[in-house]
């Protein structure tokens, strides 16, 4: 979380902004709030980028103002305007690109005074695991498959029954390049299971952490999937 | 659940002063702008001024400049509106109301004011 | 300030028919403007807001359109709950400023 406060003038607002990451290829969000004002026609918003010459996006007399708009942002941004009133200038920004990856800034002018906050925003590719019985290995195996992860992460397994064991030596992962040239399938496979145990598949880069479940018994089998942005700082 | 509940009906005698309250529960009273808005019996909406209550920043209706003072408990989450020199045309039902999620978006019950001599 | 002209004051209509309520303001307010119902004895309720959305709970028989100085809002097919007194507000500009009502009554 970062908050800054205006510097320059009479009055300052705090403008609060979360460090966040955005999944390449789809839409994210970089998040700003700021002490609202309740004169929607004094509200400016603007979205600036470290080392972009023309501005992210602009807010302003109600409306987007994107006459100074950066090419490489056109058509792809937007604010939640009816939620500007009641303080929130978060970007919603589409089909998220690897190049997006830096540092913004919020700038908010308001009717009380002026504010800004940084934010770091991170891209790269994650996803869901998900964690099979192999029915076509020749011993009790699992298959853990995750379609999109960029960059190249670590995978770990683990055990409810051997906790703290090292799974390295009994399985294999493999990264297969998709046809976009920059993300990967992650497969990795687990041999010599057994019965009445939880498995998890741990896939973890420097933005996201995953984990997938599977709880495998002589009646059933029982799976969980969970995802975690390793980067929500605020500021 | 986002609750407004504001104090009881009043009388008062011409020239004198009225305190409504509005106890605010469900959402954070210090980070949203609150506002006050009168009706007339009979009459359309009229809206009288917002409190900021996290800077007790206060925005007044030109109309009501002067002789209206809005206030904030932030301790107890609840708003004051306070309107002196009453004169019968003061007589109206008083609402505070939140501007949360969007514009006027919660209202307390109302509050009857009656002037009369 | 913003005026804002609701049309008509009032209107007669039954059960089932599509009921239209227009509001005007003196200057263009974007996109700034929400509508609300209210009937007597209740404080006002949020319907609809930055124009078109649809508050929380609000039936989708309810609509709203318009953008600048010209706004509607449209109750398709009007059912027995819905006759009430109905005001627009634009919170584009200070101050926020209400419409005069619309009352819907039964015919």
């Known amino acids: 979380l970062i908050i800054g406060f205006g510097i320059s003038g009479r009055h300052s607002i705090t403008v609060t902004t979360v460090a966040s990451a955005g999944n390449i290829g789809e839409d994210g969000i970089l998040s700003c709030t700021f002490e609202p004002d309740i004169k929607l026609s004094d509200i400016v918003i603007q979205w600036l980028k470290e080392g972009v010459l023309g501005l992210v996006h602009e807010f302003k007399e109600g409306k987007d103002e994107l006459s100074e708009q950066d090419e490489m942002f056109r058509g792809r941004t937007a604010v939640f305007a009816d939620q500007v009133i009641v303080g929130n200038a978060s970007l919603r920004l589409k089909n998220v690109q690897l190049t997006d990856a830096g540092t913004y800034k919020c700038y908010i002018i308001t009717s009380k005074g002026k504010g800004n906050a940084n934010l770091e925003y991170k891209t790269g590719a994650f996803s869901m695991p998900e964690v099979n019985v192999d029915y076509n290995a020749s011993s009790e195996t699992l298959r853990c498959e995750a379609p999109r992860w960029f960059p190249q992460p670590t995978v770990v397994w683990a055990s409810q029954v051997d906790q703290g064991a090292n799974f390295s030596e009994v399985s294999n992962t493999s990264f297969e390049l998709n046809s976009e040239n920059v993300t990967m399938k992650v497969v990795s496979v687990l041999y010599n299971v057994t019965i009445n145990n939880t498995y998890s598949c741990m896939i973890e880069n420097d933005i996201a952490k995953a984990t997938g479940d599977i709880k495998v018994t002589e009646s059933e089998i029982k799976r969980r999937s969970h995802l975690q942005l390793l980067n929500s700082k605020a500021s | 659940e986002v609750q407004l509940v504001q104090s009881g009906a009043e009388v008062k005698k011409p020239g004198a002063s009225v305190k409504v309250s509005c106890k605010v529960s469900g959402y954070p009273f210090t980070s949203y702008w609150m506002h006050w808005v009168r009706q007339a019996p009979g009459q359309g909406l009229e809206w009288i001024g917002a409190?900021?209550?996290?800077?007790?920043?206060?925005e007044y209706a030109p109309k009501f400049q002067g002789r209206v003072t809005l206030t904030a408990d932030t301790s107890t989450s609840t708003a004051y509106m306070e309107l002196s020199s009453l004169r019968s045309e003061d007589t109206a039902v008083y609402y505070c109301?939140?501007?949360?999620?969007?514009?006027?978006?919660?209202w307390g019950q109302g509050t009857t004011v009656t002037v009369s001599s | 300030d913003i005026q804002m002209t609701q049309s008509p004051s009032s209107l007669s209509a039954s059960v089932g028919d599509r009921v239209t309520i227009t509001c005007q303001a003196t200057q263009d307010i974007v996109k700034s403007l929400n509508w609300y119902q209210q009937k007597p004895g209740k404080p006002p309720k949020f319907l609809i807001y930055?124009?078109?959305q649809l508050a929380e709970g609000v039936p989708s028989r309810f609509s709203g359109s318009g953008s600048g100085t010209d706004f509607t809002l449209t109750i398709s097919s009007l059912q027995p709950e819905d006759f009430a007194t109905y005001y627009c507000l634009q919170f584009y500009e200070f101050p926020p400023t209400f419409g005069g009502g619309t009352k819907v009554e039964i015919k």
């Open positions: 930055y124009t078109a």
């Open positions: 409190i900021y209550p996290g800077k007790s920043d206060t």
């Open positions: 109301t939140s501007t949360w999620t969007h514009y006027f978006d919660y």
